[in-house]
Interface confidence: low
Amino acid sequence: CPTSCKCSSARIWCTEPSPGIVAFPRLEPNSVDPENITEILIANQKRLEIINEDDVEAYVGLRNLTIVDSGLKFVAYKAFLKNSNLRHINFTRNKLTSLSRRHFRHLDLSDLILTGNPFTCSCDIMWLKTLQETKSSPDTQDLYCLNESSKNMPLANLQIPNCGLPSARLAAPNLTVEEGKSVTLSCSVGGDPLPTLYWDVGNLVSKHMNETSHTQGSLRITNISSDDSGKQISCVAENLVGEDQDSVNLTVHFAPTITFLESPTSDHHWCIPFTVRGNPKPALQWFYNGAILNESKYICTKIHVTNHTEYHGCLQLDNPTHMNNGDYTLMAKNEYGKDERQISAHFMGRPGVDYETNPNYPEVLYEDWTTPTDIGDTTNKSNEIPSTDVADQSNREH
């Protein structure tokens, strides 16, 4: 444990003013594992002036950092980059003249306590005023800054010319794009101080590159993947005071694909489960032994789960008999193309025929497709047929 500090397995505290510490406490190799430290308390350390970029990075489990009544003047921008668990920071009564939001923007902080610091009234700390104004809790801090006359001024009264939140405006074409095509988004940002512009593309799969020049930026997305349909793309403007973003949703049109089609399973009803992808939403058509299957209340398509451009459902059959055994083909079609897949279904043997002679179809419950709640019922009511007994034209046995 560093001189002037005490350590336990989860805590480091340095409160003795003499001899004091001149650098952020670091644990000796082969001592306590720094990853297990959840709290660091530093007080009365007038010679601790700087938190360098790599001082805190080893304490990845750190939740509470308290440095009070000390000499902290500078904190490196990336000091807390690896401390994603930090929830409480208390820098009360230090020598901080400035502090950037960049120190903390990646953290999910519950508390950031900064009272008693000699902040300089400048645009650098305007973000703190904005933070105070947007905080819902009533216990807002009394933060002050020193103006040009070295007079203490409440941060709430701080007025700095040319120092405000930035703006971002996305000029996007119709962001409905065909798979494989390309699109370019343009964004302009504004504000004083002049913001930086960056793109937040999340987990975009498609190849993309951006160009930024001062207040203008463009993002070119090439060979657009259907996996990116529904994803949000944001243009972000960021300056000292804060950030603004403008977002668009990408819609990718693509030909249907039947990614899953299985033999029937029995639950409340018999179900031939399927998954179809496509955008716009594909029209579904079933064929039985090569002929169009007219749906009815006894045989109908049910979509149970829609996941953006993916549809999970069933061809639902009520009490099918051996007359319904046969080849079932699903065709999915939209304006960009079509796909079809076929399975052989065996519901029961013919009366008097030993079931054991028939193929063994597993009776697996396919819960995803047989939930009672239907999402997006695509039942075709136009060609109703009276019963499940569809004529077995080929007279084939299965």
């Epitope: 004091g20 010679r47 700087i50 360098n52 000499g71 490196a76 921008y77 003249t97």
Partner: antibody, heavy 116, light 110 residues
Framework: QVQLVESGAEVKKPGESLKISCKGS????????IAWVRQMPGKGLEWMGI????????RYSPSFQGQVTISADKSISTAYLQWSSLKASDTAMYYC?????????WGQGTMVTVSS | QAGLTQPPSASGTPGQRVTISCSGS????????VSWYRQIPGTAPKFLLY???QRPSGVPARFSGSKSGTSASLAVDGLQSDDEADYYC???????????FGTGTKLTVL
């Protein structure tokens, strides 16, 4: 070993521009502040400003704000002090120093002479 | 900018103890630590003491520092002829958000 090496002496005319350098080695250049200090002939030390090379955050002494520009290029571990228009009163020795608890490492100094 | 105040000169005979004072205000020495630097004319300053009284490695124990309120002092024990130099104190000034140096003291070994 830790050292700061400054560029050579300069003789300039009033109104000319100048950029002097300070190259750090033997330590993590991006994680220590660099200070610039002026010493006019026969006079004491004056603090001009500091820069954090990791992100080029810069602070100036009120006396030097607007008179000089401090910058850094972390890719080559070098800090700079520049003037856009020199005056005769800028004639001095200029030192760079690393901030590590105090100004613990100093450059050898760059003598700048401004004379018509 | 207002710096720290030091006596222009100090002197002593070899073997003597000499102290150099450094006076500031509540915004610098009063609330921050003091460092000391030594400069032989024609060369760069050298780091002598930091944190009011801490010696970097290589600095003889003859050099010591102290601080009280808004003043600090440097003491040189067992004065030697090669201690002749200019000595500067420095401290961070909160109101200036920057360092301030002392006016400098020329130490002469008689």
């Amino acid at each position: 070993q830790v050292q700061l090496v400054e560029s050579g002496a300069e003789v300039k005319k009033p109104g000319e521009s100048l950029k002097i350098s300070c190259k750090g080695s033997g330590y993590s250049f991006t994680t220590y502040w660099i200070a610039w200090v002026r010493q006019m002939p026969g006079k004491g030390l004056e603090w001009m400003g500091i820069i954090y090379p990791g992100d080029s955050d810069t602070r100036y002494s009120p006396s030097f704000q607007g008179q000089v520009t401090i910058s850094a290029d972390k890719s080559i571990s070098t800090a700079y002090l520049q003037w856009s228009s020199l005056k005769a009163s800028d004639t001095a020795m200029y030192y760079c120093a690393r901030l590590g608890g105090g100004m613990d490492v100093w450059g050898q100094g760059t003598m700048v002479t401004v004379s018509s | 900018q207002a710096g720290l105040t030091q006596p222009p000169s100090a002197s002593g005979t070899p073997g003597q103890r000499v102290t150099i004072s450094c006076s500031g205000s509540s915004s610098n020495i009063g609330s921050n630590t003091v460092s000391w630097y030594r400069q032989i004319p024609g060369t760069a300053p050298k780091f002598l003491l930091y944190g009011n009284n801490q010696r970097p490695s290589g600095v003889p124990a003859r050099f010591s520092g102290s601080k009280s309120g808004t003043s600090a002092s440097l003491a040189v024990d067992g004065l030697q002829s090669d201690d002749e130099a200019d000595y500067y104190c420095a401290a961070w000034d909160d109101s200036l958000s920057g360092y301030v140096f002392g006016t400098g003291t020329k130490l002469t070994v008689l």
